[in-house]
Amino acid sequence: AITEAREEAKPYPLFPGPFPGSLQTDHTPLLSLPHASGYQPALMFSPTQPGRPHTGNVAIPQVTSVESKPLPPLAFKHTVGHIILSEHKGVKFNCSISVPNIYQDTTISWWKDGKELLGAHHAITQFYPDDEVTAIIASFSITSVQRSDNGSYICKMKINNEEIVSDPIYIEVQGLPHFTKQPESMNVTRNTAFNLTCQAVGPPEPVNIFWVQNSSRVNEQPEKSPSVLTVPGLTEMAVFSCEAHNDKGLTVSKGVQINIKAIPSPPTEVSIRNSTAHSILISWVPGFDGYSPFRNCSIQVKEADPLSNGSVMIFNTSALPHLYQIKQLQALANYSIGVSCMNEIGWSAVSPWILASTTEGAPSVAPLNVTVFLNESSDNVDIRWMKPPTKQQDGELVGYRISHVWQSAGISKELLEEVGQNGSRARISVQVHNATCTVRIAAVTRGGVGPFSDPVKIFIPAHGWVDYAPSSTPAPGNADPVLII
């Protein structure tokens, strides 16, 4: 069986810079320190046993040669433990081991931070056979190092199902500071303090931060990253950035604009999408929001009639979808309409006023004081009424529609008459004797037919009756009147 031995390592700080066994490659050629030098590698922690110094596994083979001499323990030779280099530079490092020739098919694999490196990496393994042993040198090269190449690299070799692991080679890629948090654009309330954050990392550390506002440095001396700037308030737009400095140089963050919230600009392009007798659908294009979201809008409606009392109707609505149906308007009327919108700061001015008109509508009330009486001499029913109030005609009267229903012995017949707008009386022929005639009248405009009046009933007797009184629209509260003669 193969046993495992572990060398103890002398701890050296891994950071910030060179130490025995580390290598700054910017100016120094790569060194391979021989095992005999007495060099002890840096303190590295085994991924499987955190906290324990680890310098690789040593396989002690139990196989003996013909002369029964035990073979020397197999271990990777010590090499450089720490390489420090700048971003975009090239680096090459290697592992070497001497393996007795009795072992066949030995392969070396490279691992970084516990994961095997496969595929498109520049790893080359060279074999130098001798009489009894073969020297194997595994080289790993990176042509242009990036921060992501930082880490701990090891070689592994499998022999007889046992693993031999090299000491780690720690690669530290240094470069300009790299931002992990940059200031963000904001919209702020005037004269109100707010915070901006900037964070950058190396290596090398430390990273120091300067804040810049409108091209002027805010802090005379740098602050260690991360840094929070409390801006005491602004009265006008400002541009902020932060500078991150380390020993390699300076990186400047993106510049961010901090805007001051203000009342919105007035809406523009208020337009009429649709008009009916009692409503107008309007739309508008919102003005600039003042760097603060719109909350709601107010539609102001004034009668354009110079004789009107000038009162303003106000309708509140949500800011979206920039559409509103104004209801409860009079038909055939002219209105001035303006729109104003608000954000958290306040209301915009009112948009330019536009003129809009409602269309004709069907009358909203029925003719009044409908009276009905029988004229036996001419065998007619005379009907009289009063036209609805002008305000409620909702347009120009073009006439009236008269509905008369004749009911007798289970038979019912409805007839409709149209009457010109000038009259306020009509005469209809008696259709059926010994029957009830029910009359209703509606006013008519181009906008349509209005509501019918309450029904007025009159009884039409058989021939020979003499005395007839008129029937009329009942007083409110009396439903369905019938005149019995």
Epitope: N191, S216, V218, N219, Q221, T230, G233, T235
Partner: antibody, heavy 118, light 106 residues
Framework: QIQLVQSGPELKKPGETVKISCKAS????????MNWVKQAPGKDLQWMGW????????TYADDFTGRFAFSLETSASTAYLQINNLKNEDTATYFC???????????WGQGTLVTVSA | QIVLSQSPAILSASPGEKVTMTCRSS?????MHWYQQKPGSSPKPWIY???NLASGVPGRFSGSGSGTSYSLTISRVEAEDAATYYC?????????FGGGTKLEIK
């Protein structure tokens, strides 16, 4: 609490040198710049410049280049103002002031009166 | 360099009066600081970054302004307010102070 304590008054002759000190306490000295402000008798405040307490690099206002020197003794949290080849017009009270964001001088020394007279 | 002009140079007021002093800059600046100085004393920080009262400053003081025009207002002057008030700009190097406004109480 934060304090800036300046050295006492000085009476000097023209051509001599004076070095006044400003000892800071109550905060990390090397985190904030130290500014120097001149006030001649009955006159306005004049910003002379500042010294970076971390790097030791001084910055002088245009009217204070040449004969004026800012320096530090970081281990003692002390900043110094030295004026060489003193002139009568150097007679003034000199204040040190702790720098902050937006060049806000939230803490001032009590002032050192330097009198230059033959 | 930016020149700060304070007016008036001397301001005389009775207790309870409202007073305003102004500081105009030769170019636009981001913030104006104000300091109060009484004879024989070092300046005291008074108003930070245009409108923020320093610790211990009474609420009757206020600051405002932007661009090239800034002001310090005392809503009801008290005897203890007698002092010289200096403005100092932030926004351009070198740092500069105004010539001061001396407030006298009648």
């Amino acid at each position: 609490q934060i304090q800036l304590v300046q050295s006492g008054p000085e009476l000097k002759k023209p051509g001599e040198t004076v070095k006044i000190s400003c000892k800071a306490s109550g905060y990390t000295f090397t985190n904030y710049g130290m500014n120097w402000v001149k006030q001649a008798p009955g006159k306005d405040l004049q910003w002379m410049g500042w010294i970076n307490t971390y790097t030791g690099e001084p910055t002088y206002a245009d009217d204070f280049t040449g004969r004026f020197a800012f320096s530090l003794e970081t281990s003692a949290s002390t900043a110094y103002l030295q004026i060489n080849n003193l002139k009568n017009e150097d007679t003034a009270t000199y204040f040190c002031a702790k720098g902050g964001h937006y060049a806000w001088f939230a803490y001032w020394g009590q002032g050192t009166l330097v009198t230059v007279s033959a | 360099q930016i020149v700060l002009s304070q007016s008036p140079a001397i301001l005389s007021a009775s207790p309870g009066e409202k007073v305003t002093m102004t500081c105009r800059s030769s170019s636009s600046v981001s913030y104006m600081h104000w300091y109060q100085q009484k004879p024989g004393s070092s300046p005291k920080p008074w108003i930070y970054a245009t409108s923020n009262l320093a610790s211990g400053v009474p609420g009757r003081f206020s600051g405002s302004g932007s661009g090239t025009s800034y002001s310090l207002t005392i809503s009801r002057v008290e005897a203890e307010d007698a002092a010289t008030y200096y403005c100092q700009q932030w926004g351009s190097n070198p740092r500069t102070f105004g010539g001061g406004t001396k407030l006298e109480i009648k």
